[in-house]
C-alpha cells in the first residue's frame, strides 16, 4: 500500500491545506490527510495513541475499498472477518469462524461440516468404493497346489475418502475359505516357500481340513473319489522324496 501523509504548505483555513504531499488532496498538520486524490483510498493509520489520515492505493487486510463520487475510503470488514469483498461478503474469516457463502459462522449449517484446514463449511463427503474385483485364486500359504482347502480373497478400491462427518468406508478386503481338486505341485510350482521350509509332520491334533466358512460359495464336502487311503498317501510320500528333497509336507 502506498501511503501518503499530509503536510501543510499553504494555509487555506485554520489547520487545512491543499498543498499536500503525495496522495492527499487536503491535509492538516494535526490530522494528516483529510481527503485523497482520485482513485486513492482514505484510511486512518494508528501511530502510537494517535490516528492520522493516510491515502492508499489499496486497502489493508481487514478493510475493503468503498467508492462514492470523488470519495474513496477503506471500510472495515465485519468483526469476524479477516478479508472481505464488501461489508456483506467475507472471503476469509477470523480464527474460530467458518466461511459459508460469504458469511462467517461459529458452526456450519445442517448438511455441511467444518474444514479446519481451509476454515470453510464444506459439503459432507461420504465414502465411495468400486465394485469388487474378481476372487483371487484359491491359495494356501501362498501356494495354489498341494492342498485341498485354502482361502481366496477379493478387493475393491476406495474411490472417494469420506470427510470427517461422512459415512465410513466399508471393508475393502474379503476373504473366504475355498476347496480345490487336490493336485500335486509340479516342480516349477514349488517356489521359494517350499524349498526354504523344512519338511515337517502335522502337529498332533492339527486338522488337515479347514473349517468351512459360512460365507464360502463353494461346498466344502469331499467327494468319495477325492479320498485317498493311508497306504496311497505313504506311497506318494516316498515317491515325492525320491523326486525332490525340497518338498514340504502339505498341510
Amino acid at each position: 500500500q502506498n501511503a501518503s501523509r499530509g503536510r501543510r504548505q499553504r494555509r487555506m483555513h485554520p489547520n487545512v491545506s491543499q498543498g499536500c504531499q503525495g496522495g492527499c488532496a487536503t491535509c492538516s498538520d494535526y490530522n494528516g490527510c483529510l481527503s485523497c486524490k482520485p482513485r486513492l483510498f482514505f484510511a486512518l493509520e494508528r501511530i502510537g495513541m494517535k490516528q492520522i489520515g493516510v491515502c492508499l492505493s489499496s486497502c489493508p487486510s481487514g478493510y475493503y475499498g468503498t467508492r462514492y463520487p470523488d470519495i474513496n475510503k477503506c471500510t472495515k470488514c465485519k468483526a469476524d472477518c479477516d478479508t472481505c469483498f464488501n461489508k456483506n461478503f467475507c472471503t476469509k474469516c477470523k480464527s474460530g469462524f467458518y466461511l459459508h457463502l460469504g458469511k462467517c459462522l461459529d458452526n456450519c449449517p445442517e448438511g455441511l461440516e467444518a474444514n479446519n484446514h481451509t476454515m470453510e463449511c464444506v459439503s459432507i463427503v461420504h465414502c465411495e468404493v468400486s465394485e469388487w474385483n474378481p476372487w483371487s485364486p484359491c491359495t494356501k500359504k501362498g501356494k495354489t497346489c498341494g492342498f485341498k482347502r485354502g482361502t481366496e480373497t477379493r478387493v475393491r478400491e476406495i474411490i472417494q475418502h469420506p470427510s470427517a462427518k461422512g459415512n465410513l468406508c466399508p471393508p475393502t478386503n474379503e476373504t473366504r475359505k475355498c476347496t480345490v481338486q487336490r493336485k500335486k505341485c509340479q516342480k516349477g510350482e514349488r517356489g521359494k516357500k517350499g524349498r526354504e521350509r523344512k519338511r515337517k509332520k502335522p502337529n498332533k491334533g492339527e486338522s488337515k481340513e479347514a473349517i468351512p466358512d459360512s460365507k464360502s460359495l463353494e461346498s466344502s464336502k469331499e467327494i468319495p473319489e477325492q479320498r485317498e487311503n493311508k497306504q496311497q498317501q505313504k506311497k506318494r510320500k516316498v515317491q515325492d522324496k525320491q523326486k525332490s528333497v525340497s518338498v514340504s509336507t502339505v498341510h
Epitope: 487536503t26 490530522n31 486512518l44 463520487p69 471500510t75
Partner: antibody, heavy 119, light 107 residues
C-alpha cells in the same frame, strides 16, 4: 471566514419542485464537498446528499428519484431541487461544507432556510 | 443503512454536572463519528469528529470516546450555554445518518 447562505422560496405547493441555492463565500466550491441536510420542525437531522469539487453528486437513496444537486462555479453556488414534494418535505434546509474523512464533517453550515409545503 | 440509536432522548441536569450521552451504531463504524450541538433556531455546530477530536474553539469540557459500535459524548462540567440538543452522526459509509438527538435541559 467561510460563509454559506441558503436562499429560495419559503413556500412550495404539494407535487411541485422545491428549489434552493447555497451561495458560498471565503472558499471555492471546486474544492471539497458541498452538502444538503434537512430538519423537519421539532425533529432530527436527515442527510440528503452532496456535490463534489468535480461536480459529481451523491443522493441519499431514500430521496434519489426526486433529488437533483447541481452547481454554478461562476457564481460559486450549488443548488438543490426536490421534485414531487409533499407535506413531509416541510423542513429547515441547511447547506454545509466538509473537507474529507480526516476532518470535521460539516465544519461550516449555512443558517438554514425553512421551506413549507402547503397548498 | 446504518442506524444510530442515541440515548437518552432528554435529560435534566444542573450547572456543574457531568453529563454523558451515548450513541450506538447498528454496526462497527470504525471511529467515523461526529457530535453536534444545536440551539433552537440555529444551525448545528460541530463539536467533535473522528470520535474524540475537538473542533478548534470548542471548550475542553467536551470530550468524545468510543470504538466499534458504542460512542460517548461527555460534558465534564455543564455550563449554562451547554443547554441544547446534541446529535451524533456516523460517516463510515453513505448515506450518513444522525442519532435522534438528546435534549439537555436545566433541572
Amino acid at each position: 471566514e467561510v460563509q454559506l447562505v441558503e436562499s429560495g422560496p419559503g413556500l412550495v405547493k404539494p407535487s411541485e419542485t422545491l428549489s434552493l441555492t447555497c451561495t458560498v463565500s471565503g472558499d471555492s466550491i471546486t474544492s471539497g464537498y458541498w452538502n444538503w441536510i434537512r430538519q423537519p420542525p421539532g425533529k432530527g437531522l436527515e442527510y440528503m446528499g452532496y456535490i463534489s469539487y468535480s461536480g459529481k453528486t451523491y443522493q441519499n437513496p431514500s430521496l434519489k428519484s426526486r433529488i437533483t444537486i447541481s452547481r454554478d462555479t461562476s457564481k460559486n453556488q450549488y443548488s438543490l431541487k426536490l421534485s414531487s414534494v409533499t407535506a413531509a418535505d416541510t423542513a429547515v434546509y441547511y447547506c454545509a461544507r466538509y473537507y474529507g474523512y480526516g476532518g470535521p464533517w460539516f465544519a461550516y453550515w449555512g443558517q438554514g432556510t425553512l421551506v413549507t409545503v402547503s397548498s | 443503512d446504518i442506524q444510530m440509536t442515541q440515548s437518552p432522548s432528554s435529560l435534566s441536569a444542573s450547572v456543574g454536572d457531568r453529563v454523558t450521552i451515548t450513541c450506538k451504531a447498528s454496526q462497527d463504524i470504525d471511529s467515523y463519528l461526529s457530535w453536534f450541538q444545536q440551539k433552537p433556531g440555529k444551525a448545528p455546530k460541530t463539536l467533535i469528529y473522528l470520535t474524540n477530536r475537538l473542533v478548534d474553539g470548542v471548550p475542553s469540557r467536551f470530550s468524545g470516546s468510543g470504538s466499534g459500535q458504542d460512542y460517548t459524548l461527555t460534558i465534564s462540567s455543564l455550563q449554562p450555554e451547554d443547554f441544547a440538543t446534541y446529535y451524533c452522526l456516523h460517516y463510515d459509509e453513505f448515506p450518513l445518518t444522525f442519532g435522534q438527538g438528546t435534549k439537555v435541559e436545566i433541572k
